[in-house]
Each structure stands twice: as structure tokens, then as C-alpha cells.
Interface confidence: medium
Amino acid sequence: WELTILHTNDVHSRLEQTSEDSSKCVNASRCMGGVARLFTKVQQIRRAEPNVLLLDAGDQYQGTIWFTVYKGAEVAHFMNALRYDAMALGNHEFDNGVEGLIEPLLKEAKFPILSANIKAKGPLASQISGLYLPYKVLPVGDEVVGIVGYTSKETPFLSNPGTNLVFEDEITALQPEVDKLKTLNVNKIIALGHSGFETDKLIAQKVRGVDVVVGGHSNTFLYTGNPPSKEVPAGKYPFIVTSDDGRKVPVVQAYAFGKYLGYLKIEFDERGNVISSHGNPILLNSSIPEDPSIKADINKWRIKLDNYSTQELGKTIVYLDGSSQSCRFRECNMGNLICDAMINNNLRHADEMFWNHVSMCILNGGGIRSPIDERNNGTITWENLAAVLPFGGTFDLVQLKGSTLKKAFEHSVHRYGQSTGEFLQVGGIHVVYDLSRKPGDRVVKLDVLCTKCRVPSYDPLKMDEIYKVILPNFLANGGDGFQMIKDELLRHDSGDQDINVVSTYISKMKVIYPAVEGRIKFS
Amino acid sequence: WELTILHTNDVHSRLEQTSEDSSKCVNASRCMGGVARLFTKVQQIRRAEPNVLLLDAGDQYQGTIWFTVYKGAEVAHFMNALRYDAMALGNHEFDNGVEGLIEPLLKEAKFPILSANIKAKGPLASQISGLYLPYKVLPVGDEVVGIVGYTSKETPFLSNPGTNLVFEDEITALQPEVDKLKTLNVNKIIALGHSGFETDKLIAQKVRGVDVVVGGHSNTFLYTGNPPSKEVPAGKYPFIVTSDDGRKVPVVQAYAFGKYLGYLKIEFDERGNVISSHGNPILLNSSIPEDPSIKADINKWRIKLDNYSTQELGKTIVYLDGSSQSCRFRECNMGNLICDAMINNNLRHADEMFWNHVSMCILNGGGIRSPIDERNNGTITWENLAAVLPFGGTFDLVQLKGSTLKKAFEHSVHRYGQSTGEFLQVGGIHVVYDLSRKPGDRVVKLDVLCTKCRVPSYDPLKMDEIYKVILPNFLANGGDGFQMIKDELLRHDSGDQDINVVSTYISKMKVIYPAVEGRIKFS
């Protein structure tokens, strides 16, 4: 008979997903854990496997603003939603005193909460009676499984359990409860508790009749094989302890903060002996989607703690570097992307002599106002593009003489190094600057993509030739000091909205990956 | 109890018979393979022997126009007709995404399709549930045989499985499934899968309870005795691996392209131990007649292919210069187009440290066999592309040291000027040659596009670094004198059909206009 034990411990109010280091989630595409994601994985396993228990080994309480505000009500609510089968009391469950445990959690939980080594006395005894139990027998498929709980006997030094709870030695307290389970013909027994890995191992060794130990408190990470994240395993999962009576007892723990879901498969024979055990903690990373209903509930609870433009147009798999540190000093891939979109938006194959009417683009680096980070699942939205191109301009078509273009490129670097906006990004142009030369004579090579050709290739710019160029209306109008364009242009046709040009291109391409490819060089 | 395992792998849509080198059949009297011939041999063995399984180890998808047009429907139809007993998923089964696997194949196959190490998550989990299985127990005569599947964990880098499939380590995933089969009293277990010969051997060594491994992916040819055709055996058939628990586990593979039918006879004892194994791949040459009914069906399906090859895939507004006068002497825009398509076909954004796993392409100019004229309304058809790439090759992924790449570029121009095919076209590479220098020392600049970067840009090639490169299988196998690639490559994964890669890119782009942009220069 095979049992799947899913287990968490030391979740410490990480109800929402977190960064890899279990701090506040910043970059959602790299975030981990959280109850919505945990539920997805638990449900997946419940659907796939017949005999599943979901257990928590304590210390759900304490750790984020969630606990500060909701004081444990959030624990009961979301653990109920996830249909936990049992929980052991951890030391932090007493952080708000016994009342802070009884009211929000013990009275609201729809699952048994356990500890065999906590004994109530005085007036508390009757008040807390039945709200937590030493053990619980759970039906699982056609079998029954006994769960016996324990809590660190150090809790009075670690939390606020008050004077009416006695924390006994774990092993001393557990043995009679296990013996009782045996007399009830329960032959499969899990010790679930919160005393740390060393105590977990001692329980496995010393408590006769315990088949499996599921622990917490020490945030122990166990793993068999190559670990999937940054945690270094303290041993194999499960950690096998040979009991004093010669049995192999698997001991497990699942690190902390809901980053992993412990996954242990146990095979029992007909007499309840463990005949095999294997598994591993499952890293709850972003490859596991967050369950939408739980996520919605989280978002609803979240309020108390604190449409086109947001839709995805396409994806980037590279960082779109629209920073002024790049685009005002050197070729930047955001500039290349925008220029490529501008050319693509102007394909007009009208004549067999010309592959296209225009092949060149120039774009003032200062007009690129923001980068786009690819680490948001690569998503690019209109909102993102509006930050890059916030001025609501157009991308226009002009006709210029080669000599005008040469002047424009000299202007591009006439006061290079001062982070000024006139530094030109390009498409269909290869330019080489020599900054050691005097301003006005720094362009040492200027090759442009032919249009009157069947195979586009680069030829030196001819001063007297007339070229078509796509550029922002801002430049056509002489902006950023490009007076020569305004003064010398031979024709100017206003074009499409800048954001629209780029968004259309991205939608068409679906996935983009512009490079810095040597359009602009310095000799 | 004796079992006959008939097996194929890496058939790559060779539904029709092929030439001896697995390219298009020219002289029918000397052609080999094809499903009609395969069926004849399978039926002959089924009639002669009592306990026969016909298995496929993946990569039926991708390789000829059959796949381009029928998108997997042809695989389901003809594998059903041949009454395959089981198939493992290969990486290429995901080339058209998960939908392209589910609809034509998973939903239509009358045989189980297997993979134990692919786990579905998110919305896909319920959609794909039951359509592929980790294992299947097949009745064979009076016995049962468990078949457990596996797929290369590199699939996310080699194909398009999307984000809702997790490819686990093969051994880690297989063990629990094999254990489950054991608990079901299945004592004869075949691991059928697609991860390459090295992994096949590891599975045989490490996965307790696997009796036989039937593999694919590496196109491994094994043979005992004198081989019957041009393939050189990598070892004896079966290849015997001693498992960690001391069993002798036969491992087999049957080359590729349906040229051979693997034939393995296994003798099991009453406890399901393999006590003997022997066999050999059977060369499906013209001495085996094609089955008339299957052949008639093939001819019926063929009609749609002829129609497809004349339909427009997309348009070019430039002349696609695939002339030998250009591509064997200098950068040609047909070479750029093909390399750009090769990179685009290999976008697998798996890791934030890397914008992509591969950025470089090389392509022997001699492999470009025709230009495409844009003056036919710009139309590009499959027929046009088949003239450019007539050899039915694949565009493969290799790992090479920088020093090997440097040797390859020296070889590219070692006898420059004689119109020889080894002149390399490139993508993600900027190379400068000085032909005045002596052969072997002509590469004066070799810059390559970074992958471990968020903004792709060009850096000098490092001799000791390992790079991934996309190239034709012809080059990976040392063709055109590129012996250094064959001898020094560190990894080789076969890729998609060459024409299919370019046609998909053109269909996606709709309008293309590749330029000669300075990737290859002469100083």
C-alpha cells in the first residue's frame, strides 16, 4: 500500500509568492512559493495519486505583514482552502499567546492540530480541550494512518505559551501515544512535529512504532540528487534512521517559507512496515502556475494590506537597452529595434530597379526614453512602449542629399561624451567615427544600404546623391540641433505614430531579439 | 519465454522509400526503407514468431515535405496501419508545439505514446491528461510487458514544448514508474525512449528493474558481424550494459530514417530476468518488396504534397542570391537568409543569464544550390526552396571549442578562389579574412555574438570557450573537408529539415529582404 506524504514547515506567513531568497517578490517571473502555487502542485498530485496526505509541521505563524494584520486568521483560511489534513503546533504558533492561537486558528481550522507533548493544566485545560489533540487517526483510501504531533520543548523560551501549558520531552510523551495507536490496530504511524532535525532523528531512533517522521523548526533542506535552487542539502531525502529496534525510518523536512513542497512516497506492507520510501522536495518555482482561484482570494485579502495598454503585444528575449547611458553614447539595441520597425513599416516595392524606396533610418538617441526589461516574462505592452516613446511623435519620410546626411552625422558626435540627445541610432547605415579628430570632421566612414539594387548591400555615401530616410518628425523639424535637416530637406512626408509603428512590428515578429551588431563603430 | 522486439527510431517522416543515404529516392530498384517495405518485413516476422512487439523510439516528426504538409497526421495514420504497439515521444514531436502533437498524433494514435519524464502543468495538465502516458502494460501472448517511455531532457533547447511541460531527468523520472510497474507484478520492463545512446546506457546502468533499453536520438547504428550497408557500427547489437545491481541489460538503437528495422530476441525466465538477448538490425533494402496496400495508400496521400510544393509560402522583395559565383566567394544574402532562419528556429529562452542558448550559424556556400528570383511577384514556394536545398539535410545543433571554429574558418578560405563549396556563410559571426596571408593563417578577425548576455553584441572568439553553433548535418559529419568539426565536436543534436526551417521562417516573416551587411569582410 502506497502513501504520498506532502509536507510543509516553517512557512512563516509567506502566503504570496516570494523572491528566490524568500523576500518580497520583485520579479514575478522568478518568484517562488505562495499558497496559490502550492495548491496547484498539491492538486496535481492529488489527481494523479490515490493516497495523499498534506501535512504541516508547524510555524505557519509570524514572518510578514500578513501575520501582522491578520494574526493567524489567514493561516486558518488558506490552510482550509488547501485542505490540509493535519498540522503540528510550532513554537511560533504561541507568539500571540494561547488566545492568539485558540481564536484565529484552533477554532477555525477544519483539520486536526496536533501536539502530544503539550499538556494543558489549570483553567486552560477545559478551555482548550479537544481544540488540539495528541494524535489523530486519518482514513486514507481503504487504510488508516495515525498522525502523532510534537512541539519543541524549548517553546517557553522561544514564544509566549503562558504558564498553563507544559512542554514535555518529545520522546517521553510520544511513546505512550504511539502505543495507544498500536492498541487501536493502527499500524501506520507518522510523527509530525516541530522540534528540529536532531530531535526528529532521535524520535525516529527511539520511539517504537513510528514509521515516518515529518519535521520542522530547523529549516532543514534534504535532497537526493542535484538540488534545484540555492539551498545546500543537509543530507539525502528522505534521511534514513535505523531505529533501535532495527527498522529503517525515513525522516523528512522541507526547508522553509513555502519554497518547497515535501514529497515523500512510502510503501507499506500488509503489517504496516515501511518497505520503501523515496521522494524529494519539489521546488515551487515559476514553472508551476499559481492556482487562479487561490490567487484571486489572495488578491482579495491583499487589499487590506495595502485595457489595451497592459496587454501583451509580443515578447522580447533580450534586454531592450533604451538607457541614456547607452543610446546617447553608442549603438543600442533599442535604437536598432525602432529603426528596423521604421524600415519595415515603409516597405513599398514599386519598381524592379529598386528593392525598396527607402533603406535608411536615423533616430536621435535622446528620443529613446526608457529601456524594457525582458525579465517580465518577456512581455511587451503598449504601456511599455509609451515609456520608451512618450512624446506621441510620428516616424516620417524625408529626402536628403548625401551631403546633408554627412552633416547630420557630424552633428551626432560634435560634442560627444556629454550625454546629449543628438547621438544618432541608425538602420541601413554603417558609420565609423574617429573622436580624436576635430568636431565637424569625425565621420571617417559612412556606408549606406543601396535601394537601387536587387540585393541590398552597403556602398559609400555619395555627397550629391538624393536619399530617402525615415526619421522622427522631431528631427525633420530640426530638433536636437539638426537644423541642417530642416534647412536642406528636399521633401518631407509625415508618417505613422511612433508607438504604433513599433507595436505593429513587434506584433508581427512575435518574438524579438535585437542585437548590437556593429552599425556604429569608433575607430 | 521469448520476446521479439522490432524497433525503429528517428524515422523523420521517411514514409516513402529513400536512397541509400536516406535522401529522396531516385532509382527505385536501389531504394530502401519506407513504411510499405517496413510493413512487409514486420508482417513476415509477426507470422513467423509468437511474441512480437513493434516499438518506435521517437522522432517520427520532421524531415520531409510529408511532415510539413500533414503535420503528424501521416505519422498517426501509417503507424496505425503498421499496428505499432507503442511509441516514445522524441524531441521533434514538439516541433509544432504541444497542439501540433496533441491533435494530429496523440488523439489519433491507436497505440500508447509514452514519456515518463515529461510532466504537464497548468492548464495543459488536464488538456493532455491520458493522451500520453508514463508507461503502458502490454499483453504479449500469455505474458505482460511493461513499456516505460522517456524523452531527452534537452527538448526545451531542441524543440518547442512550451512552458507547461517540464522535462525531468530521465533516470530520476523513470525509477518511480518502473517501481510502480514492479508493484503491479510486471516483471518484464522495456525502457523505450529518445535521449541518445549515452543516456540509454545510463538508464540501463542506473534504473533498477529495466530489462531492455530501446533508444533513439543519436542515430546510433549497432551491429554484430559484418554490416550490410554504409553505416559503421558504434558497437555490437545488442550493446550490453552491466547495471549497478549486476544485471546484463541489452541496449539497442536502429540508426535512423527507417533504413533498418531493429530486431532483438529476448529470452526471459519465469521471474522476468533477461537470460539471453541477440539480434541485429535488418536492412530494409529492395530485396524486401513494398506491401501493395500500404504503397497504394502512400500514393494516395502523396497527391497533396505535389500541390503544396507550388503554393506561396511568403514573398521576397529582393533577389535571393544563391549563385555559386556569390555564395562560394563572398557573403551572399541567401546565406544570410538561411542562417537567420536557422537561428530563429532555435530560439529557446531558458535562462536569464542567456538571451538564447545559441547565437551562431555556419553554412557551407556549396550547400546553396540555387538563387530565387524576386521578379516572379516575389513568390517563394517549397519547390523554389527545394532547388536551393535539394539534399534533404537537417540543421543541427553542435557544441564546439573556439579553436575548432577558428580552424573551420581557416578551412573556409584555405584554397579561396577555386569556387569550392567550403566557403562559409554565417549568422551571429563577423569574420575578416586577409587572403594575402598563407593558408591556415588568413582569419584576421573573428567576432561572435554573445549568448551569456542580456543584450546580444559581438566579442572576439575565445579559443578555449565552448560555443553552440547551428549548422547543416553535412558539416557536423565532416563534409566539404570540415574534418575538424566531426573530430572535435563536443555534442551533436540533430535538428529540423533544412527546407522546413527556411520555409517556416519565410511564412512567419511574410515579406523578406535580406541584405549583404558586412558579416564577411576581406581586409
Epitope: - | 546484463k248 525466465d269 537470460i275 539471453s276 538477448s277
Partner: antibody, heavy 120, light 106 residues
């Protein structure tokens, strides 16, 4: 049905040699190693070695290297053991034996044995 | 080479007895152990392989167990036709037989 039929008893003089045959039938001869085992009178069993009929490759117990030579004739599905420089120590019953399978040497099929007596 | 040492060398039995023979390997041989029965004037017969797997047609009163260096062969209820010599054999490294245990009638 698998059968191994050995040649008859041999009486040979010291220093001479002898060739014992083992005719196999009822199975694919080339697919299974043929092993040879010595049993001295009233004693245990000693493995001599095996030959792989497929390719003629052989493996010997070091004790018998130089003493025994194993050969096969695939066309007649017969295995042979040649013993040379015989002494009284070589007097024994010699068995050919085939494994249950071709991996592990579990001898499921045995010849009837050939008695070799070395005597002046 | 690996030495297989059986215990005892002789065993006097009556019909219906339970008989256990052990065989100790001089080093670990995993479970690569077989047991044979040989009657006078006959070739040996394979009874057990892989230490515990009964060969086809062998009655279930014959069982084997063990792993590593210590192996046991048991006849649960001896019958008259079981009187014979029993050999253990390892093929973990090269191939060696034990000296044999002779079952005789009391």
C-alpha cells in the same frame, strides 16, 4: 528441446592429448556460450572456460590455461575441447554445459559427460 | 579467485526432514549464486539461480536465499529422490563451485 551430446569415453596415455566433442541441438547454437566443466572422481566441479560460438572468442579459468583449448564448428553446431600433455591429474569426467541464458553462467543444460582416463 | 565454502559436507536425513545447507563466499558475490543437484552417474541439474529464483520445473520445496557472502539452500520436506550432492556456484567474478554437500539417508 535443448540437447548436448558428448563423445564417448577416452583412455589415453600420459603425455598424449585428447579432443572431446559436444554436439548441440534444439537451439540457436551461435547465441549461447558453451562452457566446459571438469569433475574429478568423487570431487567437486571445476569450471574450465567457455567459448562464444558467434565469434570464436573464449575465456579460460587460469588453472586450465595451456591445458585446454576450446573450439567450435558452427556449421555442425559442435563444440570441442582439446586437452594436451595429459597426466593422471587430468583423469575426470568432462561436461559441456550451456547457460540458461547468455549472460550469467547458470548451467541449465549439460552434456552426459565424457570420462577421460589417463593411464600408462 | 573466490572460494565458495559449503557447510556441512555431509548430512544424514530422514524423509520429511527440513534441511538447510549454507555456502559462504570468500568475498561479496552480490546475488550471483546458483545451486545444483547431482545424483550418482548423472550430470548436475540447476535448481536455483540469482540466489533465490527457482529454475523452471523445480519443486517449491527447494528454496534459496542470501546476498553478499552468506547463502542458504533449504529443502523444506526432504523426499527420497532428493538424496544427492548439492553444489553452490558463483559467477560474480570468474566462476567457482563449492565442494558440495552430500545428503544421505540416516
Amino acid at each position: 528441446e535443448v540437447q548436448l551430446q558428448q563423445s564417448g569415453p577416452e583412455l589415453v596415455k600420459p603425455g598424449a592429448s585428447v579432443k572431446v566433442s559436444c554436439k548441440a541441438s534444439g537451439y540457436a547454437f551461435a547465441s549461447y556460450n558453451m562452457n566446459w566443466v571438469k569433475q574429478s572422481h568423487g570431487k567437486s566441479l571445476d569450471w574450465i572456460g567457455y567459448i562464444d560460438p558467434y565469434n570464436g572468442g573464449s575465456s579460460y579459468n587460469l588453472t586450465f590455461k595451456g591445458k585446454a583449448t576450446l573450439t567450435v564448428d558452427k556449421s555442425s553446431t559442435t563444440a570441442y575441447m582439446h586437452l594436451n600433455s595429459l597426466t593422471s591429474e587430468d583423469s575426470a569426467v568432462y561436461y559441456c554445459a550451456r547457460g540458461y541464458g547468455n549472460y550469467k553462467a547458470w548451467f541449465a543444460y549439460w552434456g552426459q559427460g565424457t570420462l577421460v582416463t589417463v593411464s600408462a | 579467485s573466490i572460494v565458495m565454502t559449503p557447510t556441512p559436507k555431509f548430512l544424514l536425513v530422514s524423509a520429511g526432514d527440513r534441511v538447510t545447507i549454507t555456502c559462504k563466499a570468500s568475498q561479496s558475490v552480490s546475488n550471483d549464486v546458483a545451486w545444483y543437484q547431482q545424483k550418482p552417474g548423472q550430470s548436475p541439474k540447476l535448481l536455483i539461480y540469482y540466489a533465490s529464483t527457482r529454475y523452471t520445473g523445480v519443486p517449491d520445496r527447494f528454496t534459496g536465499s542470501g546476498y553478499g557472502t552468506d547463502f542458504t539452500f533449504t529443502i523444506s520436506t526432504v523426499q527420497a529422490e532428493d538424496l544427492a550432492v548439492y553444489f553452490c556456484q558463483q559467477d560474480y567474478s570468474s566462476l567457482t563451485f563449492g565442494a558440495g554437500t552430500k545428503l544421505e539417508l540416516k
